[in-house]
Amino acid sequence: MMTGTIETTGNISAEKGGSIILQCHLSSTTAQVTQVNWEQQDQLLAICNADLGWHISPSFKDRVAPGPGLGLTLQSLTVNDTGEYFCIYHTYPDGTYTGRIFLEVLESSVAEHGARFQIPHHHHHH
């Protein structure tokens, strides 16, 4: 049975040209995290593999930095970066946990972080 929950940074906003940290945290499970995938809609941004370390997708290398921790830093933001981001925790023996973050990139200086919130755990089905 999957008992874990993922806490994410939730709905966040940031200024065009700035940076933002995407963070997820898996708790309430003793499952071993074998890999974390970061995805934006239909594209892999980065992978952190427990054995092999961090690897940034070639098409995002200039704008994505690993960390802090299992999080991801997006740099040089554009309005096209607005949208859904997913942290996908591959674990053993539980399976897959998915967290969702919505990022809005704003033109002006009104950007501010949304409140942290918890989303229920679920298996990642497609």
């Epitope: 074998t34 890999q35 995938n37 995805e39 239909d42 594209q43 892999l44 992978i47 593999n49 054995d51 092999l52 370390g53 690897h55 997708s57 070639p58 098409s59 591959h90 990642h124 497609h126």
Partner: antibody, heavy 117, light 107 residues
């Protein structure tokens, strides 16, 4: 230019072990993964495992755990794959490849292993 | 493990034809798919990575599309030198499994 030079063909007896080498040149050895791939005669490509030469971290396909052991020597920019308890099922061409996790961009020429009594 | 299925083991085509090879993942792999060309007696060559990005120096007649579970590799105008086996491979999670391969035969 980037090159991966593999050791030569091997003819070995069942039950023995063999160590295949893959010498890298033309790039920073510790900045890329080294992946290993098996191809049996008339068959497709099968991923064996991968090593991060910088950290020494390894990851294997389950069926090759206990069969293959991946190591890397940073001082000589050489990766190794040791195969143990050899049987006829291990007769194949083995490739090493430079990996960026998301793809394998340079490949060795392949090492043919024949296991026969 | 993620299973990558290439439904056609063989495909027959003529020079100048357009040909598409399909690959289906057993579960979501985002765009974490690469395509390789393997000619007899040679090492495999990378053609496409991240489902749709053409690797450096690869002719533009080779293209890739897809995301999620369904992927397609297309040669827009087949040349005689394209005779080879083509493999998809997923890089979404280890083990980095290959498809069974599709052998392109020239009529």
């Amino acid at each position: 230019q980037v090159q991966l030079q593999q050791s030569g063909a091997e003819l070995v007896r069942p039950g023995t072990s063999v160590k295949v080498s893959c010498k890298a040149s033309g790039y920073a050895f510790t900045n890329y993964l080294i992946e290993w791939v098996k191809q049996r005669p008339g068959q497709g490509l099968e991923w064996i495992g991968v090593i991060n030469p910088g950290s020494g971290g390894t990851n294997y396909k389950e069926k090759f755990k206990g069969k293959a052991t991946l190591t890397a020597d940073k001082s000589s920019s050489t990766a190794y794959m040791q195969l143990s308890s050899l049987t006829s099922e291990d007769s194949a061409v083995y490739f090493c490849a430079r990996g960026e996790y998301f793809f394998f961009d340079y490949w060795g020429q392949g090492t043919t292993l024949t296991v026969s009594s | 493990d993620i299973v990558m299925t290439q439904s056609h083991k063989f495909m027959s085509t003529s020079v100048g034809d357009r040909v598409s090879i399909t690959c289906k993942a057993s579960q979501h792999v985002s765009n974490g798919v690469a395509w390789y060309q393997h000619k007899p007696g040679q090492s495999p060559k990378l053609l496409i990575y991240s489902a749709s990005y053409r690797y450096t120096g690869v002719p533009d007649r080779f293209t890739g599309t897809g995301s999620g579970t369904d992927f397609t590799f297309t040669i827009s105008s087949v040349q005689a030198e394209d005779l080879a086996v083509y493999y998809c491979q997923q890089h979404y999670n280890t083990p980095h499994t290959f498809g069974g391969g599709t052998k392109l035969e020239i009529k």
